[in-house]
């Protein structure tokens, strides 16, 4: 959401959000390190080509041309400098003056030795419980952000954990149309069109920045849960893990895991669509879980087969119209799970992403909960080297990726609701080892197992 | 003036526990990570881990979990290592040492002056 | 874990020379490298961050080199002063730690 720099009411008045670096003489002397060269305090950017017509709503929505309803002016980083105030390296740099190339490795969770996996169940968990460095969340609309008495701005600290969950919530959230009316669903900012593999891999790439800079362990790096394996079991939910069954009611997180004590935030959905407030950092009930246990729906009682993965790599076209949940023949459509393997659409399908989320059956299968359930980052971490393994064998061909009419949010240069400070989905279309700073270790089916740079 | 000023020396049982203290001045301790590096006699240095004294945040290393705890009081500016089930190995030297909050400066910049424990 | 492998243990050389001590890290630590200094009684000092900055007030005698997985200090113009033991300490990833240490002694 915002530096907490700029969650004051003269930021907001003002429209300007560029936070000092290092004002060694007084407040205001150092916008975005202009002093030392580091960037500079510029007017936004946003897209303000046409969207589709699924959102029929224009001026409603806090998110429409994003971030302008809030700021209107924020730092432009030089060079390989980046962050709210340029204070740090862009993805895959690093030094003081952010000219270093460096290079993590995501690998396969199951493959991580036993010290790995505890470093990196307890690297979660501080997350859960780690107040985050830079960021605020708003609870309020804009038009209530400065609270009843108008002098009060509306956010609150949150972990950087549970600001992973918030932002995913806000970029899914309904649009409230007023007191009384129903909001409107069918709108959602990074799903069921273009933006959903680069939103969801900023959105992987904002946490695992914000862990190494928790753990001041640059070589952090998030692993992979490889769902394609055709079972009917969760291999990754074991105790020293992602966590077991409870053996006392079959929808929780055994009692043995750390998983057991987390509290999910943002399942307060009625309230906040009807009152017109957004999910704050309060913490309800425990992560529901229960694979393959939908004996109601028995597609989605099993995993992604692996030839499921090499089938939809071989869909050469990012995107086709009308991009949404519906396009056929489309790379981004069918790993996102809408359409089948092979590409063709088919309303009954649930594939690869969407069906892994669905066979967790429980927290991890609700839009607006998800990421509260940990297995949420395994998911889309894998998600995300199939992702790249298509950017890799098809040079990042962008050119189907649509630069108007795609659902609102979903533009090639639409800024991703509500990353800060804005970015566009462009950026993140980009093979990782080369421009991102992180590569896979992986073994795609048929192939020889390969760090992907 | 940067200083670290660590407790005096120690002579402990085996088994027993010890805690060590390192009083910060010149610097608020919320904006740094503390450290802490074991030295045995006439051996290399070893680091046991961190703690962040703004959040309570503790990493070790593996060799040191559950022996090692951390805490920090931030209202005298002051970390703290515990050890336990001591034994004769953990005769040494411990410093107490900083690191500059910005995670890109790989560095302990400055050292408390050492605590002896001797276990015996 | 990444181990970094220190050399030479121990060397001795004259007020004057240059000397050269050396660490391999077993995997690639991108320059999240240091080098201390410490003399016998005393705590560690801080010479070299990120593999090539010099710390404050560290003489220009002393540099720091390398990448990836090797990297060097290089002591020009040995003074008496610059007895004691040296060690590298890496930053990349946990637990942070420390190369064996060289031994250097002036004649």
């Known amino acids: 959401q915002f530096p907490r720099e700029c969650a004051n009411i003269e930021a907001l008045r003002r429209g300007v959000c560029c936070p000092d670096l290092l004002p060694s003489s007084g407040p205001g002397t150092d916008p975005c390190g202009s002093s030392s060269g580091r960037g500079r305090c510029v007017a936004v950017i946003a897209d303000s080509r046409p969207h589709s017509r699924h959102y029929p709503h224009d001026g409603k929505d806090d998110r429409e041309a994003w971030p302008l309803r809030f700021f209107n002016r924020t730092c432009q980083c030089n060079d390989n400098f980046s962050g709210h105030n340029c204070g740090t390296c862009r993805p895959g740099w690093r030094g003081a003056a952010c000219n270093q190339k460096i290079l993590t490795v995501r690998r396969n969770l199951l493959d991580l030795s036993p010290e790995e996996k505890s470093h990196f169940v307890r690297a979660l968990d501080m997350a859960k419980r780690t107040t985050h460095p830079q960021f605020v969340i708003a609870t309020r609309r804009l038009e209530d952000i400065l609270g009843p008495d108008g002098n009060t701005p509306q956010f609150e600290n949150i972990s950087v954990y549970n600001y992973f969950v918030w932002t995913h919530y806000y970029s899914v959230k309904k649009t409230f149309l007023g007191t009384g009316q129903e909001s409107f669903g069918d709108v959602d900012f990074s799903h069921e069109g273009p933006a959903f593999l680069t939103w969801h891999r900023y959105h992987l790439l904002q946490l695992e920045r914000d862990m190494q800079e928790m753990l001041q362990e640059p070589s952090f790096s998030l692993p992979y849960w490889n769902f394609a394996t055709g079972k009917n079991v969760c291999d990754v939910c074991t105790d020293d893990l992602m966590g077991s069954r409870s053996n006392f009611d079959s929808t929780l997180i055994s009692p043995n895991s750390v998983f057991s004590q987390w509290r999910v935030v943002c399942e307060s959905l009625e309230e906040y669509d009807t009152l017109g407030t957004l999910c704050n950092s309060t913490e309800g009930g425990p992560i529901r879980r229960n694979p393959a246990g939908n004996v109601g729906r028995p597609a989605v009682q099993r995993l992604p087969e692996p030839q499921d993965v090499t089938q939809c790599l071989e869909v050469r076209v990012f995107d086709t119209p009308p991009f949404y949940s519906n396009s056929t023949d489309s790379f981004r459509n069918t790993v996102e799970g809408y359409s089948a393997p092979t590409g063709k659409y088919d309303p009954a399908v649930r594939s690869l992403h969407n069906l892994a989320h669905l066979f967790l059956n429980g927290t991890g299968g609700q839009t607006h909960l998800s990421p509260n359930d940990p297995i949420f980052v395994l998911l889309h971490t894998f998600t995300d080297a199939v992702f790249d393994e298509w950017l890799r064998r098809y040079n990042a061909d962008i050119s189907t990726f649509p630069l108007e009419n795609a659902p609102i949010g979903h533009n090639r240069q639409y800024n991703m609701v509500p990353f800060w400070p804005p970015v566009t989905n462009t950026e993140m279309f980009v093979t990782a080892p080369d421009n991102l700073g992180y590569a896979y270790e992986v073994q795609w089916p048929g192939q020889e197992f390969t760090v992907s740079e | 003036e940067v200083q670290l000023q660590q407790s005096g020396a120690e002579l402990v049982r085996p088994g027993a526990l010890v805690k060590l203290s390192c009083k910060t001045s010149?610097?608020?301790?919320?904006?740094?990570?503390l450290h802490w590096v074991r030295q045995r006699p006439d051996q290399g240095l070893e680091w046991i881990g961190w703690i962040n004294p703004d959040n309570g945040n503790t990493v070790y290393d593996p060799k040191f979990q559950g022996t090692a705890s951390l805490t920090a009081d931030t209202s005298s500016n002051t970390v703290y290592l515990q050890l336990s089930g001591l034994t004769s190995e953990d005769t040494a030297v411990y410093f107490c040492?900083?690191?500059?909050?910005?995670?890109?400066?790989?560095?302990?910049?400055?050292w408390g002056q050492g605590t002896t424990v001797t276990v015996s | 874990d990444i181990q970094m492998s220190q050399s030479p243990a121990s060397l001795s050389a004259s007020v004057g020379e240059t000397v050269t001590i050396t660490c391999r890290a077993s995997?690639?630590?991108?320059?999240?490298l240091a080098w201390y200094q410490q003399k016998q009684g005393k705590s560690p000092h801080l010479l070299v961050y990120d593999a090539k900055t010099l710390a404050d007030g560290v003489p220009s005698r002393f540099s720091g080199s390398g990448s990836g997985t090797q990297y060097s200090l290089k002591i020009s113009s040995l003074q008496t002063e610059d007895s004691g033991n040296y060690y590298c300490q890496h930053f990349w990833s946990l637990p942070f730690t420390f190369g064996s240490g060289t031994k250097l002694e002036i004649k």
């Open positions: 040492t900083r690191r500059d909050y910005t995670y890109e400066k790989a560095a302990l910049d400055y």
């Open positions: 995997g690639n630590i991108y320059n999240y």
């Open positions: 010149g610097f608020n301790i919320k904006d740094y990570f």
